[in-house]
């Protein structure tokens, strides 16, 4: 069996601080997927760019608010399966022959998901074909089913390429990564912050905003580019010293990438093991998959 | 509290373009489109479409297909709504509504006078 | 384009007194969701409009429950039950299930 959360190549080690984003060397998160989303149902056809992670051959964790179709407000109505595909192994958008694309069996939103302030941003996609897994498509461990959540000053990676204008084809960000902000895959690395510090912060500014026990929150106080970067439902991963491995802690979730660079703007992420037994549950995994999915 | 402020007002020339913004703020920007709502004085409202704010992708009424845009700068939390080539009678107040159906919320409108 | 025709086109009512509104569509507003998206909205002279029944029944926070609304399919319904004061203004009703959406001409209500 593939093991979950170890990289061919070594992720670079966490003492040095990265403001801002770095280009990722091919295979540095082998777990990342690009989700792409194209409805049409909709005249125009409407079109949208997400993260998510790789929790098995068959298994694309991301955020319930990628997979959501925005045509009704107050209703959270999932993208038909039909328009989702999945890219895997992907580095450069502008060269996709090394990446494995996939299209989705399943789409699978958290029954509670609340678009307003975005509690319980979780959800599933399952690839039509199991991907072979290798050096660069590889997956990620999910965490122990705790509240806790990681602790504050803990720094972890989060990846993305950015997307962020999908006016144009799918083909048109694939092969020639228009409208990106970067063709390659970035990383930044960034500190988990205090619940307390972060509610906080979203309490000191008027409005309906609300960091539940099922967030966490990560950034710098003064702020940067480092909270714009990820896309969102992009997997905020933190390296456990006790397994050695790679563990999905946070999904990129709501406030930074809104306001990137603004000062105290902490970016929220989804609790991921808050919703072990949930994912589980789902993706109804056989006792061997669920020993390759969740940190020991 | 959920506040939708929109640009000042507007006099221009016909052939002219003019650029609205509304400013959102309260609520996870990205989690509702917003709409655009045009009102000719003294007349009722029409939904001239809305932009989907995840996504960029705006959807125009019929009426409004050609010198009319919708944008966004989702990093400002600021939709904008473009008409080229003004026209006399585009003369109105036009409104941006939080949603692309619901329009729970509304901003408190910005006048257009297109006179010569 | 889904017609919404509103009657009355004004109506001058006693402060304490009921008010009634009708909005009609042209074809029915059940969404294929099981849905019925149909909005009441208030504009007060000088003011920018403001939601307050969604979903044909549902009342927008903050809206006194003075003010009910009901209806199916084509046919729908405001009441106040007491009008007050600051009810004055142009009523709309819109409806967001048949794409584009389309808004009634509006109902003046007035102050007796």
């Known amino acids: 069996l593939p093991v979950c959360g170890q990289p061919s190549r070594a992720l670079p080690n966490l003492v040095k601080r990265i403001i801002g984003g770095r280009n990722a060397e091919l295979g540095l998160f082998p777990w990342q997927a690009l989700i792409v989303v194209e409805d049409t149902s909709r005249i125009p056809n409407d079109k949208w760019f997400g993260s998510g992670a790789l929790l098995s051959e068959s298994w694309i964790l991301t955020a319930a608010h990628v997979l959501r179709s925005q045509r009704r407000d107050n209703t959270v109505i999932p993208v038909s399966k039909d328009h989702v595909t999945v890219y895997l192994g992907l580095h450069d958008v502008r060269d996709k022959s090394g990446a494995v694309n996939s299209s989705a069996a399943r789409v699978v939103l958290h029954p509670d998901f609340n678009i307003q302030n975005y509690n319980h941003d979780i959800a599933l996609v399952q690839l039509q074909e199991p991907v072979p897994l290798g050096a660069h498509v590889m997956p990620i461990c999910l965490p122990r089913p705790e509240p806790e959540g990681p602790a504050p000053h803990m720094l972890g990676l989060v990846a993305g390429w950015g997307i962020s204008n999908p006016n144009v084809t799918v083909d048109e960000i694939i092969i020639s990564g228009t409208r990106t902000l970067s063709d390659v895959l970035q990383y930044v690395k960034l500190p988990v912050v205090s619940h307390a510090e972060c509610k906080a912060s979203y309490e000191s500014r008027s409005g309906n905003y609300s960091v539940t026990e099922n967030m966490f929150c990560a950034g710098y106080y003064e702020g940067g580019k480092d909270t714009c970067l990820g896309d969102s439902g992009g997997a905020f991963v933190i390296f456990d010293e006790m397994s050695q491995r790679w563990v999905a802690q946070g999904l990129v979730s709501w406030g930074g990438p809104e306001e990137c660079g603004s000062k105290q703007v902490y970016g929220v992420y989804t609790k991921v093991s808050n919703y072990v037994d949930w994912l589980l549950e789902e993706m109804n995994s056989p006792r061997g998959v669920r020993e390759l999915q969740v940190e020991r | 509290q959920i506040q939708l402020v929109q640009s000042g007002p507007e006099l221009k020339k016909p052939g002219e373009t003019v650029k609205i913004s509304c400013k959102a703020s309260?609520?996870?920007?990205?989690?509702?489109?917003m709409s655009w709502v045009r009102q000719a004085p003294g007349k009722g409202l029409k939904w001239m479409g809305w932009?989907?704010?995840?996504?960029?992708?705006?959807t125009y009424a019929d009426d409004f297909k050609g010198r009319f845009a919708f944008s966004l700068e989702t990093s400002a939390r600021t939709p904008y709504l473009q008409i080229n080539n003004l026209k006399n009678e585009d003369t109105a107040t036009y409104f941006c509504?939080?949603?692309?159906?619901?329009?729970?919320?509304w901003g408190q409108g910005t006048s257009v006078t297109v006179s010569s | 384009d889904v017609l919404m025709t509103q009657t009355p086109l004004t109506l001058s009512v006693t402060i304490g007194q009921p008010a009634s509104i009708s909005c009609k569509s042209s074809?029915?507003?059940?969404?294929?969701?099981?849905?019925?998206?149909l909005n009441w909205l208030l504009q007060r002279p000088g003011q920018s409009p403001k939601r307050l029944i969604y979903l044909v029944s549902k009342l927008d926070s903050g809206v006194p429950d003075r003010f009910t609304g009901s209806g199916s399919g084509t046919d729908f319904t405001l009441k106040i039950s007491r009008v007050e004061a600051e009810d004055l203004g142009v009523y709309y009703c819109?409806?967001?299930?048949?794409?584009?959406?389309?808004f009634g001409g509006g109902t003046k209500l007035e102050i007796k």
């Open positions: 074809q029915s507003l059940l969404d294929s969701d099981g849905k019925t998206y």
């Open positions: 509504a939080r949603g692309g159906e619901a329009m729970d919320y």
């Open positions: 819109w409806q967001g299930t048949h794409f584009p959406w389309t």
């Open positions: 309260g609520y996870i920007f990205t989690s509702y489109g």
């Open positions: 932009i989907n704010t995840y996504s960029g992708v705006p």
